[in-house]
């Protein structure tokens, strides 16, 4: 038997993936555990194998279909269970009635690119990945720029309160190396959270023009 506190958290990427993390304070040596997904009205179910991510937590991804297929909607409820093998039997360790569109976490934005760069400004664009058509334009973004000598944690957050897949960074220093990241969040969902940050995009501003002798 397993004692201790259990925490079971899952997010839906809005298309065909539910990612889950299960943490359990009690020791679970060499035990095989799975997450089982049973939708309330769909003719499919899915299972994934929980793999250790730390001493007391395990994670897995329920792959529901091809990456851009819309496998669940706001009408669905999915019963998610953590099942662990005990000898020849399976024991239920955790259960939740999961409302996918109340628990959203999108994929990180992709395809970041510099559209135009000058001495003091840089225009950057990106794309969202595997985001449901149900959101239409109801998305927001956060962005941050890493300046020389600073950390990501120190970078001020810029908020875009609409579906805008570009930004014009101003007041940059000429001939300086920067990095840029962006993340996305749907407006829908009580427990919805920000996507992971995108892969950083490195860029360099143009050098200032040399002054002419008079």
């Amino acid at each position: 038997a397993v004692n201790g506190t259990s925490r079971f958290t899952c997010f839906y990427n809005s298309r065909a993936n539910i990612s889950c993390v299960w943490s359990q304070d009690g020791a679970l040596q060499d035990t095989s555990c799975q997450v089982h997904a049973w939708p309330d009205r769909r003719r499919w179910n899915q299972t994934c194998e929980l793999l250790p991510v730390s001493q007391a937590s395990w994670a897995c991804n329920l792959i529901l279909g091809t990456p851009d297929s819309q496998k669940l909607t706001a009408v669905d409820i999915v019963t998610l269970r953590v099942m662990c093998r005990e000898g020849v039997r399976w024991r239920m360790m955790a259960i939740q009635d999961f409302k996918p569109f109340e628990n959203l976490r999108l994929m990180a934005p992709i395809s970041l690119q510099v559209v135009h760069v000058e001495t003091h400004r840089c225009n950057i664009s990106w794309k969202i990945s595997q985001a449901s058509h149900y959101f239409e334009r109801h998305l927001e973004f956060e962005a941050r720029t890493l300046s020389p000598g600073h950390t990501w944690e120190e970078a001020p957050l810029m908020t875009l309160k609409q579906k805008q897949e570009w930004i014009c960074l101003e007041t940059l220093t000429p001939d300086t190396q920067y990095e840029f990241q962006v993340r996305v969040k749907p407006l829908q969902g009580e427990f919805t959270t920000w996507s992971p940050w995108s892969q950083p995009l490195a860029f360099r501003t143009k050098p200032a023009a040399l002054g002419k002798d008079t």
């Epitope: 309330d40 009205r41 297929s69 819309q70 909607t73």
Partner: antibody, heavy 116, light 107 residues
Framework: QVQLVQSGAEVKKPGASVKVSCKAS????????IQWVRQAPGQGLEWMGE????????NHNEKFQGRVTMTRDTSTSTVYMELSSLRSEDTAVYYC?????????WGQGTTVTVSS | DIQMTQSPSSLSASVGDRVTITCKAS??????VAWYQQKPGKAPKSLIY???YRYSGVPSRFSGSGSGTDFTLTISSLQPEDFATYFC?????????FGQGTKLEIK
């Protein structure tokens, strides 16, 4: 095999209420949403609402909000749909149907006639 | 509400014909579309769910396709028992809605 058996035809006066029953068998009653759909004479299908017998969760078509009540009795695997303040345009065949994939199994229908 | 517009509203065909009925959703509904067959005085019968999946027991001459807003039900070779009314249905978002129906008659 899965079966949904509905109560018999009803004739009601305007302003009255009608309660239609739907008895399910052949599957785990608590697990699947039961839908109510109606069809006026010579017309198409209209969704009224749904109930999940296990939890009692309900979703209505706003068109019927305040007039339709859906309940269930898990001991007899029966769901009920009550429609109040009846008017002549509520004359229709009322169907219960299970939602699994789509609306996969249907009751035989209950004819409700509203006439003064 | 999502409108489901079916066409044609009626259709005359002969046994052995290939018949196509289309349904257009007023908004993107992914693949959450079903097709039903109804004969006079009877309850609808489920044919297709998730736009293209046939229920067990449904003959292979019935097929569904489409995603987003445009959907099709095809009967590859009409049989005498196929003359009926056909409805499309979206269950992507509340309230669930149906097409107005296509009446398939013998020519």
């Amino acid at each position: 095999q899965v079966q949904l058996v509905q109560s018999g035809a009803e004739v009601k006066k305007p302003g009255a209420s009608v309660k239609v029953s739907c008895k399910a068998s052949g599957y785990t009653f608590s697990r699947y949403w039961i839908q109510w759909v109606r069809q006026a004479p010579g017309q198409g299908l209209e969704w009224m609402g749904e109930i999940l017998p296990g939890s009692g969760s309900i979703n209505h078509n706003e068109k019927f909000q305040g007039r339709v009540t859906m309940t269930r009795d898990t001991s007899t695997s029966t769901v009920y749909m009550e429609l109040s303040s009846l008017r002549s345009e509520d004359t229709a065949v009322y169907y219960c149907t299970r939602h699994y994939g789509s609306f996969d199994y249907w009751g035989q229908g209950t004819t409700v006639t509203v006439s003064s | 509400d999502i409108q489901m517009t079916q066409s044609p509203s009626s259709l005359s065909a002969s046994v052995g014909d290939r018949v196509t009925i289309t349904c257009k959703a007023s908004q993107n509904v992914g693949t959450d579309v079903a097709w039903y067959q109804q004969k006079p005085g009877k309850a609808p019968k489920s044919l297709i769910y998730s736009a293209s999946y046939r229920y067990s027991g449904v003959p292979s001459r019935f097929s569904g396709s489409g995603s987003g807003t445009d959907f099709t039900l095809t009967i590859s070779s009409l049989q005498p028992e196929d003359f009926a009314t056909y409805f499309c249905h979206q269950y992507s978002s509340y309230p669930f809605t149906f097409g107005q129906g296509t009446k398939l008659e013998i020519k």
